[in-house]
Structures are given as C-alpha cells and as structure tokens.
C-alpha cells in the first residue's frame, strides 16, 4: 500500500535546492482574461500562448489579445504580438497547429462586421514569423490540415462553402457550396455532406455524402439520404435514413465509400444516436443508444470488416442531453478500456475490460481501503472512477483518468470505493498494472500529469484557494514529496506538459492574487536534476502484462499473445530520457474459442463459448446487407477477433451455411453512384458533430 505523502520514502534527497534552481517564473504583462497554450512540433520546446481579454461594454465586447512564444519549454516567453500586427485573435478557433513537425501555425483574426472576408496569420517556421492573409470568405470552423500534407488546408465558410488551399492558406478556392460537414480522409481525400436544397439543420437525413480525391476538380456522390458520417481508423461510417424515413441504420465502407456494407446493428429512431467510442484499422467500439431518454445504450464491438458486431456491454452510460460517456481507452496497456454503466437502481458504476471489450468486470478495490456509504456490504465493494459524466454533473473532479502509451501499466484516476460512484469528495487512485490493482495515492481531488515516460508523476491539489505547492512521485504514486514553487500563492488554472509524456518540464499556470491587477503567471519546473543520471539496464525489471495466474501456461494471453515489458524499478530514481522506447517481448498464444467472435447469424448462449446458429433470422432487428443487394453469405460461424494473433490450439470448423437475406435499406447502390464536376447550387446551414473530451471518434 502507498505510504502516502512525505513519509520516509527515501526516494529523492535534497530535492528542494535542485528544484528551486530549475523553477522559472514568467509574469505575463497583461490583464487576466483567458489563456490558451499550444505546443508547436514535437521535442522543439516551442510553446505559443495566446491571452485574450474581453471588456464587457453595454453595446459590444471590446477585446485584445497577446501572443507569446517560448522556445525552452516555457521557462521564458517573448511577447510576439507585433508579429501579428497587434490583431485580436479569435479564441474559439484556437491556434491551428500543423501535423507532425511541420512547424506550421494558423491564427484566425477577429475582423470588423463589414469586411469582405476573414483574416488569418500563417507561420511555417514554428511561429518565428507570421504572414497576414486576407480571406475571400468568413471562416465558420478552424482551418483543417491535411494529415498527409500540411500545405493543404480545408475550411468551411459561414455561408456553408467548402474552401481549399493548396499553398498553406496563401490562396483559397471554393470547391463546393451548401456543405454541412467536411473531413479529411486518407491520401488527401476530402469527404463532405452537402444538401442541394440548401439547408443543413432542417434536412438531416436528406444529405448527400460526397468525395473528392483531386481537391475539388471532380466529385463522386458515395451515399445519399445521409444523417451524418464519421471516420475512424480504416472505416468510413454513414448513418442513413431507412425506408420509412424515421429510422437510421449504420453503413460501413473500408474503401473510401466505393462499396458499402450495412452494419449488423439495431436501427435507431430520431431521438436516439450512434457513437463510435473508439476505432482503429482493425475494429470499432460502437455505442447504440436505447430508445427514450434512458441515458444509456449498448456497446457493440465489430469484426475486422466493421459489419458484424458482438454485444459487449449493456446499460452503458451515455447521456442523451449532454452527450457524456465515461468510455476511456487505457493507453498504457493493450486491450484495456474503462467506462460506466447505469445500474437498475440508477446508480453509476465503473467497469473495466482487459480484453478489448470481450468481458467487463468491476474494478478491484485497493487492498487496504474501506467501503464507503454507498456499499451494502462494508467488506465487499469495488473501485469506481470518475470521468466525463462526473465532471459534467459538477462533482469535484478536476481531471479525467490519465494514461500514456510510453508509461506502461500506469493509470491515474479520481475515484471512490463502494457500490457505485459517490458524490462525496473523490481521491486519486493509481494503478501500475493497467487497472488490475489500485492504490489510493492522494487524498482529495488533484490535477496530475506524467513526465519522463512515467519516471515522475506531478500532482497539484484542486482548491478554490490560491496554491503554491506541487507534489511529485518517482515511484509510480506510492510515495509523494512536496515542493513549494513560489512564496506567493496563485490561483491555479492548469498544468501543462509537452504531449507524449517524454518531457521533464511541467508548467503551472495561474493568475496572481494582487492588490493591483491580477495577471497571468506561469512557473516552469524542470525535474532534470531530480533524476540526475540516465537509467541503465539494472534499473529495469521484466514484467508480464495481464498476468493474473503465474502458474497457468496461458497467463498473460490477451488477444492471442502475451507481452513482457522492461519496466523501471520503483526504487530507481533515474531518467528514462526523451528517446526512451518501450521494450517489449511478445509471444504468441494457442487459440481458444475466446479468440473468436460469432459471425453473422450466430450467437453465444450465456455461459457458453460455442457459437450457435440463430434459429430464426426473420423478424430480427439485425439486418445484414452486402453492397446494397441480396447476397449469399457463407460462414463457418466463427471469425477471429480483430487484432488477435493466436496460432494453433482450437480451430473451430463448422459446416458452411448459406444465409440469404433481402436487404431492406434504401442505401444508394454502387451502380447508381454518379460522378460530377465542380459546382453546385447555393444555400446555407450548419451541422455540428460532437467530439468528446476523451476523443470519442464520432457522435452523429
């Protein structure tokens, strides 16, 4: 169990002087309004900070913004507002940072009402210089970079025009009118929904999904009667209005819309929704909302085609009103996901899956913890972790659960121990094995971040009072030491560290409590002298992931293989370093029936691992449709779980069945698909896709 804060952990000696020498204060010489921070590039140390200040006047709001740049991870900042001609920047568009290490930045300016178009400031040298460009349109959305080529930009106008630039925003061309939603696909493809009647908001379900592969020279309508569309991994999804026009069904394409399959998922009515919770090139987690304002639905996991789905979790919490779900991919361990269910008694309970949604179980409570008042049995309860739903309902939860791919097995989360999520003040819990076991690491709510690939965890208490203390741990949250980073406490607003958890620097943002004017201030602390030496081979130990029974030959097998990692010893206080690469040794497992999904037309009876044929397909909600026509489907009843690498062992062979089912979707068939050249009728409107804080791939 965790010794707690400042008990004799014996981890880091003389740390106060070391940290004091590496603590850098910067007071921003402007009034406290709002602040946004962006990292430009990876491992460049370049940070851009935009402060904006709105003065509420009776008739209008007067605003001013300042732009600051750091090239040493936030230790020093230079006011570069003059590079953007002291222009007021629109914060709702943020700073559009180019992909990878392109060094590109686009800032969208606030312009006066009568102007012909908007204005942007562009930089392609990591914000050392900016070029002002007047736009021939008023942007509705932030500029979208092509993932393949950062010179190619996409934007929607307030008039619902789709505009493309091929020279990093220097020149713009309107390639289509009446566009509701646009997204970059693979290889420079652009997908968008358009309504030739002109309205986006009123005619959802009557949109056309179009594609251009040549930046607007030609178009192909790949689907009609579209409600919405989304991209996830290799999959293109469209929710399509069915025959009666009141129900929608999901269609999936893996070839950019050339051909479509109808997903074997229940159709939904107008008050329901679909949401892709997670997707990669192998599979999809899809949430299907229950009818009525239930606040929950069912999670389905797909096969590798994205068409056949297995029921993964029922009563999955996903609010209809705010669109909150607690679904989280634990990135520090393969196959691990957590989320919440809405129990019959309306309590919210946390569950975890260690096998990519195959099975969901409660989280094991820390060994030494007592069950709280929500527990019926004071000895038997589980850990419940707070995520988006708790934050949305106003609980004292400052952060979502946190994990990083390069900090293997490490998970930090707010939680409580009982029968359900508690409304009481939460504590911070840490797992070092991907969610199998947990310790209570910190009392009360905190902000937290991971540095040096898990070598250091930094936390700051969540308080309404000004603060001046940070806590840090060099042993994955077991022991904590405190450091007073300033004599004068500040109102804390955020903790910033370079994305990717490889940095040794942490920036504490806040504003001063002042007799004069409250100002933005940042304190950047470099932990390089705490972890004085580079880690060596002796500092690492072998760890088998997903190990629950060392006696079992199959111990650690998840999705057909097990992985051994080299993990930093908790007692080692050393630097993993910026170039640290996770060392893992995979080994293939023998196949069992658990490595297979039931194919279309088959299901698993409860407590049985065998797939049996559905006795009667007719009348089921689930439809299966290949290419929009009646098809023969041949199946042996089993299909390997996407990403499963097992070999040998059980190889389920069943006689081949011929399943015949008429497709009832009025989805546009490929033979009806038509190409057309640029240009279409005018109109306006807007359609917003919802993207969740925890990167929900698509919510229709």
């Amino acid at each position: 169990s965790a010794p707690g804060e400042d008990e004799e952990c014996g981890r880091v000696r003389d740390f106060v002087a070391k940290l004091a020498n590496n603590t850098h204060q910067h007071v921003f010489d402007d009034l406290r309004g709002s602040v946004s921070l962006s990292w430009v590039g990876d491992s460049t140390g370049v940070i851009l900070v935009l402060t904006t200040f709105h003065v509420p006047l009776v008739i209008m709001t007067f605003g001013q913004s300042k732009l600051y740049r750091s090239e040493d991870y936030g230790k020093n900042f230079k006011d570069i507002t003059d590079l953007i001609n002291n222009t007021f920047i629109r914060t709702e568009f943020g700073m559009a940072i180019g992909p990878e290490n392109s060094g590109k930045v686009v800032l969208t300016a606030e312009v006066s009402g009568g102007s012909r178009g908007g204005r942007i400031f562009r930089s392609s040298d990591f914000a050392k210089n900016f070029v002002q460009t007047d736009l021939p349109f008023h942007p509705l959305t932030q500029m979208m970079y092509s993932p393949q080529n950062s010179d190619y930009l996409l934007a929607l106008s307030t008039e619902n025009g789709l505009w493309v630039s091929k020279n990093f925003g220097g020149k713009w061309e309107e390639i289509h009118k009446t566009v509701c939603l646009a997204k970059w696909g693979r290889k420079g493809t652009i997908f968008f929904t358009a309504n030739h009647n002109g309205s986006c908001s009123n005619d959802r379900g009557m949109l056309e999904l179009e594609r251009t592969t040549d930046y607007g020279k030609s178009f192909k309508t790949v689907a009609s009667k579209i409600y919405s569309f989304g991209l996830g991994g290799k999959f293109l999804f469209a929710s399509v209005m069915t025959g009666k026009g009141t129900l929608r069904a999901i269609h999936v394409s893996v070839d950019d819309g050339d051909t479509w399959n109808m997903a074997q998922l229940p159709p939904v009515g107008h008050e329901q929704f679909y949401s892709i919770l997670a997707a990669n090139d192998e599979m999809v987690f899809m949430h299907v909302d229950e009818p009525g304002d239930s606040g929950f639905g069912t999670i389905y996991v797909s096969d590798d085609r994205g068409t056949v789905y297995s029921k993964s979790l029922e009563r999955h919490l996903y609010t209809t009103t705010g669109g909150e779900t607690d679904f989280i991919n634990v990135t520090s361990l393969r196959g691990v996901f957590t989320t919440s269910i809405l129990a019959e008694d309306k309590s919210v309970q946390s569950v975890i899956s260690f096998d990519q949604g195959g099975e969901w179980v409660p989280l094991r409570k820390p060994a030494d913890s007592k069950c709280d008042a929500t527990a019926r049995d004071p000895e038997k309860c589980s850990l419940h972790i707070h995520a988006a739903y708790s934050i949305a309902t106003g609980l004292n939860v400052p952060m979502l659960p946190l994990s990083e791919p390069n900090a293997v097995g490490l998970v930090l989360a707010h939680g409580s121990v009982g029968d359900a999520i508690s409304v009481m003040r939460p504590d911070v819990y840490v797992s070092d094995d991907g969610g199998y076991t947990w310790i209570k690491a910190l009392e009360g709510p905190h902000y937290y971040t991971i540095l040096d690939s898990g070598g250091i965890i930094v936390a700051i208490e969540h308080s309404s009072r000004p603060i001046n203390v940070i806590k840090f741990s060099t042993d994955e949250g077991q022991c904590w030491q405190t450091y007073t980073f300033t004599r004068d406490p500040i109102y804390f607003t955020g903790l910033a560290s370079e994305p990717g958890a490889r940095s040794m620097n942490i920036s504490i943002w806040g504003f001063t409590e002042s007799f004069l004017t409250s100002q933005w201030v940042s304190y950047t602390i470099d932990f390089k002298d705490i972890l004085e030496r580079n880690c060596e081979e002796k500092d690492y130990t072998i760890w088998l992931a997903h190990s629950t029974d060392p006696e079992d030959y199959e111990d650690g097998c998840i999705l057909g293989y097990k992985e051994q990692f080299l993990r930093l010893r908790k007692s080692s206080v050393c630097q993993n370093g910026r170039d640290y690469v996770v060392t893992k040794q995979p080994s293939i497992c023998l196949c069992s029936l658990e490595d297979f999904l039931c194919d279309f037309g088959y299901y698993r009876p409860e407590n049985d691992s065998k797939c049996v044929e559905q006795p009667e397909l007719k009348g089921h909600d689930l439809e299966f449709c290949l290419y929009g026509r009646e098809e023969h489907l041949t199946t042996n009843g089993y299909r390997k779980i996407p990403g499963d690498k097992c070999q040998g062992g059980v190889n389920p062979v069943r006689e081949v069945k011929d399943l015949k089912k008429k497709c009832t979707s009025n989805f546009l068939s490929p033979e009806k698909q038509n190409s057309k050249s640029n240009g279409s009728a005018g109109g306006s409107g807007g359609l917003n896709d919802i993207f969740e804080a925890q990167k929900i791939e698509w919510h229709e």
């Epitope: 009034l31 406290r32 309004g33 200040f53 709105h54 003065v55 509420p56 006047l57 009072r465 000004p466 109102y491 001063t512 409590e513 002042s514 007799f515 004069l516 004017t517 409250s518």
Partner: antibody, heavy 117, light 112 residues
C-alpha cells in the same frame, strides 16, 4: 466604461456601525484590487482599506484596523466596507476606487458618512 | 508612515502659461520590483478625484499630453505646459510603495 457607485452612507452616532457598498460595472471586477478612500471635511484624502483581486488579502491603516472590514463579492461585482466603533474623525465622503498597474485608477462619486451625536 | 509634502499649497496661474507642482516623500518610493508608485490626482470643483499620472510619468488614458510627470527616489514634479481652464482644481500626489498608502495635502491651482 468603468462605473463605481457607492451607497450606504448615513448619519450615525459615535460607536455605531454602518455598511457601505460599491457596485462596479464596465470591467471584469474579479481581476482588480480595490480600495476605499475617504475625504475629510477639510479636503484631505485618507486611504482606509484595500482588498486584493480575489478577496484573499486585505490591508488597513492603523487608524481603522480592528474597526473596519473590507470585503468583496466577485459574483455580484460589489465591494463592501463594514464600519463599527465609529468616531467623529471617521466623518467624510467615502470613495470606492479601482486599481490597475498602480493605485486609485478610477473613483466613484462617493457616499457621505457623518459621525455625530 | 511616509509623509508626502506638496508645494506650493496654492498656485495662481494664467491660462496658457506653464505650471509646476512639487511633491517630496520622507522615504524613497522605489519599490523592490523596480517600480516607483507615485501618482498624481486632480479633483475639479464638485467632482471626485481623477488620476492623471501613475508610476511617476505614465499618463492615464484621455489625459492631455500637456501634463508630464517626472522625478525619482523622493523628489517628484508635475508640470503643465500650458494651463487650460479645465485644469483648475486641487492636485494631490500619493505614494503606493509603502503601507499605509499616503496622500499629499493638495495644491490648489487657481486663476490669477
């Protein structure tokens, strides 16, 4: 435009209490430190109390320490001065002032406090 | 407490002519942060005081550039290059470097 409007001034007996209010508008109240300054009948200006932007810190001159309490409600954009144990030398016009990079950047029109038997 | 001494107490001027007011503090007003918290205020007849100059020499917005502030340490001066009718009233200096904050007794600028 910055607007500060004081209220609550009155005629009060020595030893009595009074609470002054100052309603602020035209700026983001929670960002700025605030003060009360009084002007005595002989036109001298005297700083009376000061409060920091978030209301955490306060300062007073010895002449009012222990008798006056400055406070603020940032949600209501209002500054207060609670006065007790009032003396005749506390008589004057009490002005609410807003600070910026220095002190007393903006002044309200004032509210008259008279301490007399 | 820091005593602020203003001279003269009354200054009779002619419209269009220059004017100068002195303010001396009993201690240096240079703060540890490098700033000098010395303000000049003007109170026109029947009005509240209004700040003209802060941090020795910085003009508040809307203040005409005929006003200039100068000085350092303990000696400070407010100059008006050409007095106009709207400049008449009582001028106060005040310091904000040391607690308690203190004001000068005021200088009345009046017409000759």
């Amino acid at each position: 435009e910055v607007h500060l409007v004081e209220s609550g001034g009155d005629l009060v007996n020595p030893g009595g209490s009074l609470k002054l209010s100052c309603e602020a508008s035209g700026f983001i109240f929670s960002i700025y430190g605030m003060s009360w300054v009084r002007q005595t009948p002989d036109k001298r200006l005297e700083w009376v109390a000061m409060i920091s932007s978030g209301g955490i810190y306060t300062q007073y001159p010895d002449s009012v320490k222990g008798r006056f309490t400055i406070s603020r409600d940032n949600a209501k954009n209002t500054l207060y001065l609670q006065m007790s144990g009032l003396k005749s030398e506390d008589t004057g016009t009490y002005h609410c002032t807003r600070h910026d990079d220095s002190w007393f950047a903006y002044w309200g029109q004032g509210t008259l406090v008279t301490v007399s038997a | 407490d820091v005593v602020m001494t203003q001279t003269p107490l009354t200054l009779s001027v002619t419209i269009g002519q220059p004017a100068s007011i002195s303010c001396k503090s009993s201690q240096s007003l240079l703060d540890s942060n490098g700033k000098t918290y010395l303000n000049w205020l003007l109170q026109r007849p029947g009005q509240s005081p209004k700040r003209l100059i802060y941090l020795v020499s910085k003009l508040d917005s809307g203040v005409p550039d005929r006003f200039t502030g100068s000085g350092s340490g303990t000696d400070f001066t407010l100059r008006i290059s050409r007095v106009e009718a709207e400049d008449l009233g009582v001028y106060y200096c005040c310091q904000g470097t040391h607690f308690p904050l203190t004001f000068g007794a005021g200088t009345k600028l009046e017409l000759k």
